[in-house]
């Protein structure tokens, strides 16, 4: 089945529930779980096979304000020599993640949700050749 | 929160930072991007350090619908397809932000939450300790 | 339930090769890896070889020349063969399930052994 | 590989008493994911090897819980806290953080 739209739901709407404005959403920006860590392996970027760095991109109209992204350092893939290994590749693995972009109108603000495709890290893969007719 | 530039032309009342409460429009930019990792790449079967991606739903959640990783084996795959444990698959994880309903069963009232995926894996070198 | 057995000759003759099945039920070879393991009479477990859900195989070192792992996932069953046999591979050959998909790692479930007799 | 080490080789019990084993590796057995691949194995006479405890201190399911699993890095330790005729048998201690190896066994019996 599909997906129902954010504002849809299976459940009955209880009494509780704030009145929202029609075609829009309240949402709480004080985030849940805010204070988790990532508690990745120590500095797998360096040592992965399909090593990666981080930039980090910052953008004061969007909450969160900074997002890290992720770049491979070589096309192919390090080999146990140390040396890049050209018949593997290494490639990006992305996640999507939500912000809120804050909009200005003339002297209005606006909120929008949007989708941001963020590049967490890279792994290596062995090719997909074509073969030329 | 987070320092806003302000239209210098605007009265001054404005609040710089993010507001803890806003009303956003129920549209989402980018919503129609494909979240089914499955379909978007087959970099899970193809990687040296493969994975299996397992369902997670919540009707409570927006998206309802996560693909977490989970790295296939301890050890990667070598270049004649053995697994090899000189080398470690290890998960990539990260912090995504996603909608929570709030109060719970709320069609158009949420919070953020941040929740912790794992996304693929990688091949990394393992570090090695030797009993002295 | 899950299950597996083990179907193998007994005896085996020096410098033979020796071929054992095992076949599997209550479970997939497409979602779990399935290891081979053998016990010396009175001795410990020695860990053979390992073919992954995925269809790959790890193998112990010592032992890899002569080993060869293989499967059958439409009739269910996991094939080992050894090469080479001395009075020293005399043992029970176990095969055992790994727990691949709940990510333990470890082997959970074992069949009940074939005893092997290298002999002349 | 690895080399697991049991000891002892050999441990004479009385029903109802605690009984310790230990287990130590060559190697550190925790994995750049984080975590210790370290399981317990019992193989009561003339039966196959029957999981206990794996990851170091989680009970297989239908284990009794008077069995625990602890250590780190590279020590670890089983733990029956009351004996029971049916503990009987060959206790293995096994790895998978690196290619498989056990430990050589130890043997609880009763005193």
């Known amino acids: 089945r599909k997906i129902p739209k954010v504002g849809h739901t299976f459940f009955q709407k209880p009494e509780s529930c704030p009145p929202v404005p029609g075609g829009s959403m309240k949402l709480d920006i004080g985030i849940i779980n805010e204070n988790q860590r990532v508690s990745m392996s120590r500095n797998i970027e360096s040592r992965s096979t399909s090593p990666w760095n981080y930039t980090v991109t910052w953008d004061p109209n969007r909450y969160p304000s900074e997002v890290v992204q992720a770049q491979c350092r070589n096309l192919g893939c390090i080999n146990a020599q140390g040396k890049e290994d050209i018949s593997m590749n290494s490639v990006p693995i992305q996640q999507e993640t939500l912000v809120v972009r804050r909009k200005h109108q003339g002297c209005s603000v606006s909120f929008q949700l949007e989708k941001v495709l963020v590049t967490v890290g890279c792994t290596c893969v062995t090719p997909v050749i074509h073969h030329v007719q | 929160g987070i320092t806003i530039p302000r239209n210098p032309g605007c009265p001054n009342s404005e609040d710089k930072n993010f507001p803890r409460t806003v009303m956003v429009n129920l549209n989402i930019h980018n919503r129609n991007t494909n979240t089914n990792p499955k379909r978007s790449s087959d970099y899970y079967n193809r990687s040296t350090s493969p994975w299996n991606l397992h369902r997670n739903e919540d009707p409570e959640r927006y998206p309802s619908v996560i693909w977490e990783a989970k790295c296939r084996h301890l050890g990667c795959i070598n270049a004649d397809g053995n697994v090899d444990y000189h080398m470690n698959s290890v998960p990539i994880q990260q912090e995504i932000l996603v909608l929570r309903r709030e109060p719970p069963h709320c069609p158009n009232s949420f919070r953020l939450e941040k929740i912790l995926v794992s996304v693929g894996c990688t091949c990394v070198t393992p570090i090695v300790h030797h009993v002295a | 339930q899950v299950q597996l057995k083990e179907s193998g000759p007994g005896l085996v003759a020096p410098s033979q090769s020796l071929s054992i099945t095992c076949t599997i039920s209550?479970?997939?070879?497409?979602?779990?890896?399935v290891h081979w393991v053998r016990q010396p009479p009175g001795k410990g477990l020695e860990w053979l070889v390992v073919i992954w859900s995925d269809g790959t195989t790890t193998y112990n070192s010592a032992l890899k020349s002569r080993l060869s792992i293989t499967r059958d996932n439409s009739k269910s069953q996991v094939f080992l063969k050894m090469n080479s046999l001395q009075t020293d591979d005399t043992a029970i050959y176990y095969c055992?399930?790994?727990?691949?998909?709940?990510?333990?790692?470890?082997?959970?479930?074992w069949g009940q052994g074939t005893p092997v007799t290298v002999s002349s | 590989d690895v080399v697991m080490t049991q000891t002892p080789l050999s441990l004479p019990v009385s029903l109802g008493d605690q009984a310790s084993i230990s287990c130590r590796s060559s190697?550190?057995?925790?994995?750049?994911?984080?975590?210790?691949?370290l399981h317990w194995y019992l193989q009561k006479p003339g039966q196959s090897p029957k999981l206990l405890i794996y990851?170091?201190?989680n009970r297989f399911s239908g284990v009794p819980d008077r069995f625990s699993g602890s250590g780190s890095g590279t020590d670890f330790t089983l733990k029956i806290s009351r004996v029971e005729a049916e503990d009987l048998g060959v206790y293995f201690c096994s790895q998978s953080t690196h290619v498989y190896t056990f430990g050589g066994g130890t043997k609880l019996e009763i005193k």
């Open positions: 190697q550190s057995l925790v994995h750049s994911n984080g975590n210790t691949y």
């Open positions: 055992a399930r790994d727990s691949t998909w709940d990510y333990y790692y470890t082997m959970d479930y």
């Open positions: 209550g479970f997939s070879l497409t979602s779990y890896g």
């Open positions: 990851k170091v201190s």
